[in-house]
Interface confidence: medium
């Protein structure tokens, strides 16, 4: 069976007036999935993120990451889209230093 | 609801600039949204061109970066294409539309304006 | 860039029939699909979008299936007002791409 990842989108400072967010994905098997960030309603190119390993996170699930540098106050424009075993999510930049965390329900 | 009308001339000379208008009504430009200039060849082809979003930012279609401009008059609600050097290849039925970020698809288009390109 | 392959370019067909066109897209475009509809001399409407939702005031003779990279628009117990050229986008990625179209004329 496969079990769904636990999305979690946070911020950080990057530099004057730039912020990153990163997009990670936890707990989630099989390890095919596809996390990535989208400005103005189409992915990112490629260029412009950068992702991490695919990686096992000790209970026999996976684990990864996507992040990209956004400048601050154009948080609305970005979403993290995520496609697991056939199911996909949209998660939303969380405002202010909140963040955001829920599993993807099937 | 939001209206677009594009309007410019209709016949450019080839090697000289086409330059064509789109007026918003109903909305702001401002407000949200990426404004977008799609083309449509003879043969019906249809091409996305480029937007420019409500914070001034634009975005081209790389087959045409190096000859299109997207620029706008927010005191107007107009937002303007400008292609450079243009041939008969770029001659086409010209349309403005508009996306919500919830996913680039196009709700509502101009009527669309013919621009010949010839000597 | 990923290009978007519709079939047939054309097709004829009587009032009352049902009609399918498809739509394949060279790379995965995860459900990020929209369907447009063109009267002769008109400006593209559009019908569908997120690969299966029909547009406001789209009739319910209209529905739409895919996954992946392969997509369909069916059109149920077609009517005189259907007639016209089909068009798919995908907005996957940038830059977004088109269909070349389907031409549905009366048979």
């Known amino acids: 069976g496969s079990v769904p990842p636990m999305v979690n989108v946070t911020r950080s400072e990057a530099s004057e007036g730039n912020i990153t967010v990163t997009c990670r994905a936890s707990s989630f098997y099989p390890r095919n999935i596809t996390l990535t960030w989208r400005q103005d309603g189409v992915s990112l190119s490629h260029d412009t993120q950068q992702w991490g390993d695919v990686l096992p996170d000790g209970n026999g699930t996976y684990q990864t990451w996507v992040a990209t540098r956004i400048c601050q106050g154009e948080e609305q424009r970005f979403t993290c889209y995520m496609e697991h075993s056939g199911n996909h999510s949209t998660h939303p930049v969380p405002s202010g230093n909140s963040h955001h965390h829920h599993h993807h329900h099937h | 609801d939001v209206q677009l009308q594009e309007s410019g001339p209709g016949l450019v000379k080839p090697s000289q600039s086409l330059s064509l208008t789109c007026t918003v009504t109903?909305?702001?430009?401002?407000?949200?949204?990426?404004w977008n200039w799609i083309r449509q060849f003879p043969r019906n082809k249809l091409e996305w061109m480029g937007y420019?979003?409500?914070?001034?930012?634009?975005n081209y279609n790389p087959s045409l970066k190096s000859r299109i401009s997207i620029t706008r008059d927010t005191s107007k609600n107009q937002f303007f294409l400008q292609l450079i050097s243009v041939t008969t290849e770029d001659t086409a039925t010209y349309y403005c539309?508009?996306?919500?970020?919830?996913?680039?698809?196009?709700?509502?288009w101009g009527q669309g304006t013919l621009v010949t390109v010839s000597a | 860039d990923i290009q978007m392959t519709q079939s047939p370019a054309s097709l004829s067909a009587s009032v009352g029939e049902t009609v399918t066109i498809t739509c394949r897209a060279s790379?995965?475009?995860?459900?990020?699909l929209a369907w447009y509809q063109q009267k002769q001399g008109k400006s593209p409407q559009l019908l569908v979008y997120?690969?299966?939702m029909l547009a406001d005031g789209v009739p319910s003779r209209f529905s739409a299936s895919g996954s992946g990279t392969q997509y369909s628009l069916k059109i149920n117990s077609l009517q005189p007002e259907d007639f016209g050229s089909y068009y798919c986008?995908?907005?996957?990625?940038?830059?977004?791409?088109f269909g070349a179209g389907t031409k549905v004329e009366i048979k």
């Open positions: 790379g995965n475009i995860h459900n990020y």
């Open positions: 986008q995908h907005f996957w990625s940038f830059p977004l791409t």
């Open positions: 539309s508009y996306y919500r970020y919830d996913g680039a698809w196009f709700p509502y």
């Open positions: 420019i979003n409500y914070s001034g930012t634009t």
């Open positions: 109903g909305y702001s430009i401002t407000s949200d949204y990426a």
């Open positions: 997120n690969a299966i």
